[in-house]
Interface confidence: medium
């Protein structure tokens, strides 16, 4: 599923991401835009043999199990395929674990490079939330 901007903002808000660990909803929508272009089925492979999955591009070395990543920790205790569902519950729950890990949203390279320090509220402007 490819979400619309406001559609995703509403879904993320429903799942309790607004101001989760101090990160406003705009941060999460911005991250999803530049990680996956709002596509729940996005997958991207990394040079270390891991793969990033889903709307927030969660990595198989640390957070989920895809059955083939050397030394996978599976800290979210889920199959990576669950992160590709049109229902974003699994991605959101895992993202909450990631953002609580100590580095906050710096864990997402696209957020660091494209969202951090920008007007992230623009990503939810005009949305009925």
């Amino acid at each position: 599923k490819v979400f619309g901007r406001c559609e995703l903002a509403a879904a993320m808000k429903r799942h309790g991401l607004d101001n989760y660990r101090g990160y406003s909803l705009g941060n999460w929508v911005c991250a999803a835009k530049f990680e996956s272009n709002f596509n729940t089925q996005a997958t991207n492979r990394n040079t270390d043999g891991s793969t990033d999955y889903g709307i927030l591009q969660i990595n198989s070395r640390w957070w989920c199990n895809d059955g083939r990543t050397p030394g996978s920790r599976n800290l979210c205790n889920i199959p990576c395929s669950a992160l590709l569902s049109s229902d974003i519950t699994a991605s959101v729950n895992c993202a909450k674990k990631i953002v609580s890990d100590g580095n906050g949203m710096n864990a997402w390279v696209a957020w660091r490079n494209r969202c951090k320090g920008t007007d992230v509220q623009a990503w939810i402007r005009g949305c009925r939330l």
Partner: antibody, heavy 116, light 107 residues
Framework: QVQLQESGAEVMKPGASVKISCKAT????????IEWVKQRPGHGLEWIGE????????YYNEKFKGKATFTADTSSNTAYMQLSSLTSEDSAVYYC?????????WGQGTTLTVSS | DIELTQSPATLSVTPGDSVSLSCRAS??????LHWYQQKPHESPRLLIK???QLESGIPSRFSGSGSGTDFTLSINSVETEDFGMYFC?????????FGGGTKLEIK
Amino acid sequence: QVQLQESGAEVMKPGASVKISCKATGYTFSTYWIEWVKQRPGHGLEWIGEILPGSGSTYYNEKFKGKATFTADTSSNTAYMQLSSLTSEDSAVYYCARGDGWYCYWGQGTTLTVSS
Amino acid sequence: DIELTQSPATLSVTPGDSVSLSCRASQSISNNLHWYQQKPHESPRLLIKYASQLESGIPSRFSGSGSGTDFTLSINSVETEDFGMYFCQQSNSWPRTFGGGTKLEIK
């Protein structure tokens, strides 16, 4: 136990297309990548690409882009590989395997012969 | 693409001999190297994963070693059922690649 059952041998004419199937049992089909491998005598084993059945995400070896197309049907736990514009170079044994990084589980192989 | 070069291409041995098969990668692949045995008209069978981890059900006479670019599959006291082709495969990066194989044959 995990099993991958491939479709039977095919004899095709040059220029035709063929669709090979790989039925998986014994594990959660949608969760694991299915990989496809080609074997020709004297050419060893070549990785064609992979599909994640749960999402339909696919990756192809550059060499096989435009030649192979992967699909999967999660209702029947079956992965498919279509090969198009067949030539004699496509005559080979084609294997599906479960993608664990390594390949512990293989299909029995489908022999494709392309001949006029 | 990562190239895997296996040597020798053919190895002629007598049952009871011990042998070593080599697989060399064109760049470092850490320990992401796996070994397979294949008999005629059969699918490959996984022997060793991650350079040295013996797969369940594989006899202990098989062992693997190496890291980086140089890897070895050793068979301690070859038995008649061990004859066939041996392939290495890397999972360090895409595309996955295989070595050209070593044929283990009876002398």
